[in-house]
Amino acid sequence: NKILVKQSPMLVAYDNAVNLSCKYSYNLFSREFRASLHKGLDSAVEVCVVYGNYSQQLQVYSKTGFNCDGKLGNESVTFYLQNLYVNQTDIYFCKIEVMYPPPYLDNEKSNGTIIHVKGKHLCPSPLFPGPSKP
């Protein structure tokens, strides 16, 4: 028995940031799970990991340097990615593993999401800089 995953076919990352929602045919409430996002056709790069184990708080990390955060819905995990580069335009796959309660479950490979990272437009500097921030 496999979990099915739905993703948007394509997203455009303006300002080098994007939100990618992974929707599952499984309710993650009160489950111990590991949701992850993988880059490339071969899913070789694990971009971000979101770990949930019953508590309200998700544990988020990346072993590949990506700046990410995660948000949990009943049947979804949304990955928030920041500081993406144009050359990180690629296909990204959602993966889910449910560790507890038994049985262990994971997903059928999804169709993935092509994330197109748009470069920042280089505008001429204003005559007067905007207000500084603390």
Partner: antibody
Amino acid sequence: EVQLVESGGGLVQPGGSLRLSCAASGFTFSSYWMHWVRQAPGKGLMWVSRINSDGSSASHAESVRGRFTISRDNAKNTLYLQLNGLRAEDTAVYYCARADSSTWYEFDFWGQGALVTVSS
Amino acid sequence: EIVLTQSPATLSLSPGERATLSCRASQSVSSYLAWYQQKPGQAPRLLIYDASKRATGIPARFSGSGSGTDFTLTISSLEPEDFAVYYCQQRNNWPPTFGQGTKVEIK
């Protein structure tokens, strides 16, 4: 005026536990990511943990993952760090720091720090 | 993780002189680099963010420049209160990392 005041530091034996608190005032606490950054005696700065604005997600440096837990109480404008399984190398001044929820890891205000000493 | 290397480790200068501090990243951090000042017994204070933008209340004698892997903090004319340790920090990649610091001391 933005203020961050840490408390809860002290001397603890290896393997022991401690809970640090950071009381925030002068800004809308629930709108900001919050962090803990530490500084070993005479050393540089090292990021330890972060929590997002509503407390629903957290991240920890690899060296403390599984031992330290960050949490917050937005009703009390307070940030916490639970330190378990303490080691000598965790001895440091622990600072809480604020970050805008759009920049995530840019620390615009810091507390004065709480000293944690791990020694037998 | 990204390693930030600051140089020199110590800078001995007199008040009124110009200070130039360097921070080099092991890989590109775009312009997501900040500079902090720390005085003995005090918390760090944000001086510069996004490589070149001054934080609120920071005097104009502090300026930052650079992008990619090479960054510079310049203090145009040192005031007595500027003698401190300065740290760079990147937020482009996770985890955020700091340089080891440059101490600016009175000659």
